[in-house]
């Protein structure tokens, strides 16, 4: 059974992930981002189901394309380079989902824009955090 300290650690990691995803969303929605139209044409895969930490596998698998799409934006839109930002997210995701079990991600038939993709994972984080508090 999860201890209160492990629950607290999970909550902090989810809050960190949530802030990183919100920061990306704010950066790309910045009115000074001339590449937003272009970025919105890229189609991301969305999870069929995202209710448990193991479902973060679906986010992990889309982090590389996310980095490459973010590379289009001017770096001043973000505090960190996309490479470092995604690397940080990857570390958190790996810790949260764990590596004990290999979960095969199932994707929805419909793809999403970068904004829809980020909003979906932001909602996921908020939902899991609410169950922990």
């Amino acid at each position: 059974a999860p201890t209160s300290s492990s629950t607290k650690k999970t909550q902090l990691q989810l809050e960190h992930l949530l802030l990183d995803l919100q920061m990306i969303l704010n950066g790309i929605n910045n009115y000074k981002n001339p590449k937003l139209t272009r970025m919105l044409t890229f189609k991301f895969y969305m999870p069929k189901k995202a209710t448990e930490l193991k479902h973060l596998q679906c986010l992990e698998e889309e982090l590389k394309p996310l980095e490459e799409v973010l590379n289009l934006a001017q770096s001043k839109n973000f505090h960190l380079r996309p490479r470092d930002l995604i690397s940080n997210i990857n570390v958190i995701v790996l810790e949260l989902k764990g590596s004990e079990t290999t979960f095969m991600c199932e994707y929805a038939d419909e793809t999403a824009t970068i904004v829809e993709f980020l909003n979906r994972w932001i909602t996921f984080c908020q939902s899991i955090i609410s169950t922990l508090t």
Partner: antibody, heavy 118, light 107 residues
Framework: QVQLVQSGAEVKKPGASVKVSCKAS????????INWVRQATGQGLEWMGW????????GYAQKFQGRVTMTRNTSINTAYMELSSLRSEDTAVYYC???????????WGQGTLVTVSS | DIQMTQSPSSLSASVGDRVTITCRAS??????LGWYQQKPGKAPKRLIY???TLPSGVPSRFSGSGSGTEFTLTISSLQPEDFATYYC?????????FGQGTQLEIK
């Protein structure tokens, strides 16, 4: 890390067929298209076609239409390119390359030399 | 089908030189162009995507520009490892098409 590992060199007679494989690892195979590109000795790169491993959908360059077939086996993360009715002009190095929308071809296989000779 | 015309077909330059290679598309391809470097006996390597975006790990001396039908690849200060053949690739529509290549040689 992402890797595309292709099958070994082949020597074929004119009129025969060749099937080249491309085994993907280090990423979700169904999330990226597989493209096939060939290069004759001392020549440029020539795009042959693409396949979506998720749906199995394919698209071929007009030049190869009717002679090329691109397939996949998702259970072993492997893509295949079969070229039939081989002629000497098909002697080339054949590459598979991973692609997704406008990101271009970010990872390539090491290449497979196919020699067509009587 | 879209034709890609690359120029020059070959180019001699020295270490430290600034070099520019041009690619022209037969119709508007927006920003859907990539640049690839190939060394003898090796697979091509992606240098630029979406006309001007550098993937992680590609040195900043490489840069791309252009949109529509005219594109350029610039190497700001040639290094010994940059002597290779360069190709442009349009990924705007099917069939995809490459430029004929530019061989960059040591002067």
């Amino acid at each position: 890390q992402v890797q595309l590992v292709q099958s070994g060199a082949e020597v074929k007679k004119p009129g025969a067929s060749v099937k080249v494989s491309c085994k993907a690892s280090g990423y979700t195979f169904t999330n990226y298209d597989i493209n096939w590109v060939r290069q004759a000795t001392g020549q440029g790169l020539e795009w042959m076609g693409w396949m979506n491993p998720n749906s199995g959908n394919t698209g071929y360059a007009q030049k190869f239409q009717g002679r090329v077939t691109m397939t996949r086996n998702t259970s072993i993360n492997t893509a295949y390119m079969e070229l039939s009715s081989l002629r000497s002009e098909d002697t080339a190095v054949y590459y598979c390359a991973r692609g997704r929308q406008w990101l271009g071809f970010d990872y390539w296989g090491q290449g497979t030399l196919v020699t067509v000779s009587s | 089908d879209i034709q890609m015309t690359q120029s020059p077909s070959s180019l001699s330059a020295s270490v430290g030189d600034r070099v520019t290679i041009t690619c022209r598309a037969s119709q508007d391809i927006e920003h859907d162009l990539g640049w690839y470097q190939q060394k003898p006996g090796k697979a091509p390597k992606r240098l630029i995507y979406a006309a001007s975006t550098l993937p992680s790990g590609v040195p900043s001396r490489f840069s791309g520009s252009g949109s529509g039908t005219e594109f350029t690849l610039t190497i700001s200060s040639l290094q010994p490892e940059d002597f290779a053949t360069y190709y442009c690739l349009q990924h705007n529509s099917f069939p995809r098409s490459f430029g004929q290549g530019t061989q960059l040689e040591i002067k």
